[in-house]
């Protein structure tokens, strides 16, 4: 039960995280005009990964896409790449994890296969989250560097008379969305990996186990659930995993011990 809950929760947390990464990537407010200790402007500038926008005091907003590819800073390209890789890995991870969910039965898929898929999706989520966190952090670092550079020469004058006020940019909402979303995806991935351990069948193959029940001899052989005795209830019979194939009925009739952890 705890494994199913951990896996399900990991999936949901990762889903929210990846939705957040997608939202952050699409958002325009990666960097916003710094309003503190600046001349009060009648416009508000903000920039995203794909376009820059200006909101005028009237409320009129104008956005321009970055139509050049080669003319953009390498760091911006790197951030774009990290975010896209994060989204792609996350999307694939989500797809894999759907099939790996314990509560969803697909054909005669074994627990070991589900465990492997859970681990795969977990790793994908972890890498996806790390990509998003790295992307946002690189952009934030770029902003901090530019902020102090523009502060150092905030007023760059020609001959001292005419001044050009440099617009300083600070952290936009998308950065915080990205950090949180990346963190959630990472946590979801870790949860999936933890769930995988619970899903994985025990590796030990028992050669033979026999014990004497009162009046009856019941031998357990590797590969079977029980040796039929012709007597009614078999609720005391213990399933011995051997990694062998089982029928769908067996999967349904005999829940794994891990469901009751």
């Amino acid at each position: 039960m705890a494994v199913t809950a951990c896996q399900g929760l990991g999936f949901v947390v990762s889903l929210i995280g990846i939705a957040g990464i997608i939202a952050a990537t699409c958002m325009d407010q990666w960097s916003t005009q710094d309003l503190y200790n600046n001349p009060v402007t009648a416009v508000f500038n903000y920039q995203g990964l794909w376009r820059s926008c200006v909101r005028e005091s009237s409320g009129f907003t104008e956005c321009r896409g970055y139509f050049t590819l080669l003319g953009l800073p390498a760091m911006l390209q790197a951030v774009r790449a990290l975010m896209i890789v994060g989204i792609v890995l996350g999307a694939i991870g989500l797809l894999v994890s759907i099939f790996a969910l314990k509560c969803i039965r697909i054909g005669s898929m074994e627990d070991s296969a589900k465990a492997n898929m859970t681990l795969t999706s977990g790793i994908m989520f972890i890498v996806s989250g790390l990509c998003a966190i790295a992307g946002v952090s690189v952009f934030a670092n770029m902003l901090v560097t530019n902020f102090w550079m523009s502060t150092a020469n905030m007023y760059t004058g020609m001959g001292g008379m005419v001044q050009t006020v440099q617009t300083r940019y600070t952290f936009g909402a998308a950065l915080f969305v990205g950090w949180v979303a990346g963190g959630l995806t990472l946590i979801g991935g870790v949860m999936m990996c933890i769930a995988c351990r619970g899903l994985a069948p025990e590796e030990t193959n028992y050669k033979a186990v026999s014990y004497h029940a009162s009046g009856h001899s019941v031998a357990y052989k590797p590969g079977g659930f029980k040796a039929s005795t012709g007597f009614g209830s078999n609720t005391k019979n213990k399933k011995i995993y051997d990694g062998g194939a089982r029928t769908e009925d067996e999967v349904q009739s005999y829940p794994s011990k891990h469901d009751y952890v």
């Epitope: 009060v40 402007t41 200006v54 005091s57 617009t167």
Partner: antibody, heavy 120, light 113 residues
């Protein structure tokens, strides 16, 4: 047709108060920021104050800060300028002007103005 | 505050001739975010309120004749009337629309020679 009509001007003694009004019609008042601009006799234009669409952003000229208060009532399509502690240098024609939506913050429509005279 | 300086203070031009008014700002009115200039030109005829002629340094407001044109960028701007008409006699003001407090030039009085 866009119309802005100012009222409330008159003669007031120094230190006195006056409340100017600006009635708007012919456009959706709540969609636009509005400015007050004044012009002293024989002088140039001087921007006084600005209020945004939803009154969330308000700016004043340094010369009137702390003495003048701009406000608006979108339900009544009206703009106000409460002027306290009036001085002789506040004598001017006061215009209300609409901040254009896509005119790079320029004022696209102006009222005819109302005259304020501060004198003892 | 941004200081707007117009020149000349007054100008006399013959009908049909070109009139040029200059405006300089103490700081650049070019917004880095969209590479647009936030400068407007107004015309004020005697006894009337100002009328918007040009915004964004070069865009004519609706209903403004095409003989009026604006140019310039950053700190130096120009209003040009290509062929002066009698009805163009007025005072012309430039205005900073980028920084609060919004500031106007002192005005240029245009007359017919």
């Amino acid at each position: 047709e866009v119309q802005l009509v100012e009222s409330g001007g008159g003669l007031v003694q120094p230190g006195g108060s006056l409340r100017l009004s600006c009635a708007a019609s012919g456009f959706t008042f709540s969609d636009y920021g509005i400015h007050w601009v004044r012009q002293a006799p024989g002088k140039g234009l001087e921007w006084v104050a600005y209020i945004s669409r939803g009154s969330s952003t308000i700016y004043y000229a340094d010369t009137v800060k702390g003495r003048f208060t701009i406000s608006r009532d979108n339900a009544k399509n009206s703009l106000y300028l409460q002027m306290n502690s009036l001085r002789a240098e506040d004598t001017a024609v006061y215009y209300c002007a609409r901040g254009g939506y896509d005119t790079r913050n320029a004022m696209d429509y102006w009222g005819q103005g109302t005259t304020v005279t501060v004198s003892s | 505050d941004i200081v707007m300086t117009q020149s000349p203070d007054s100008l006399a031009v013959s009908l049909g001739e070109r009139a040029t008014i200059s405006c300089k700002s103490s700081q650049s009115l070019l917004n880095s975010g969209n590479q647009k200039n936030y400068l407007a030109w107004y015309q004020q005829k005697p006894g009337q309120p100002p009328k918007l002629l040009i915004y964004g340094a070069s865009t004519r407001a609706s209903g403004v004749p095409d003989r009026f044109s604006g140019s310039g960028s950053g700190t130096d701007f120009t209003l040009t009337i290509s062929s002066l008409q009698a009805e163009d006699v007025a005072v012309y003001y430039c205005q900073n629309d980028l920084y609060y407090p919004l500031t106007f030039g002192q005005g240029t009085k245009l007359e017919i020679k």
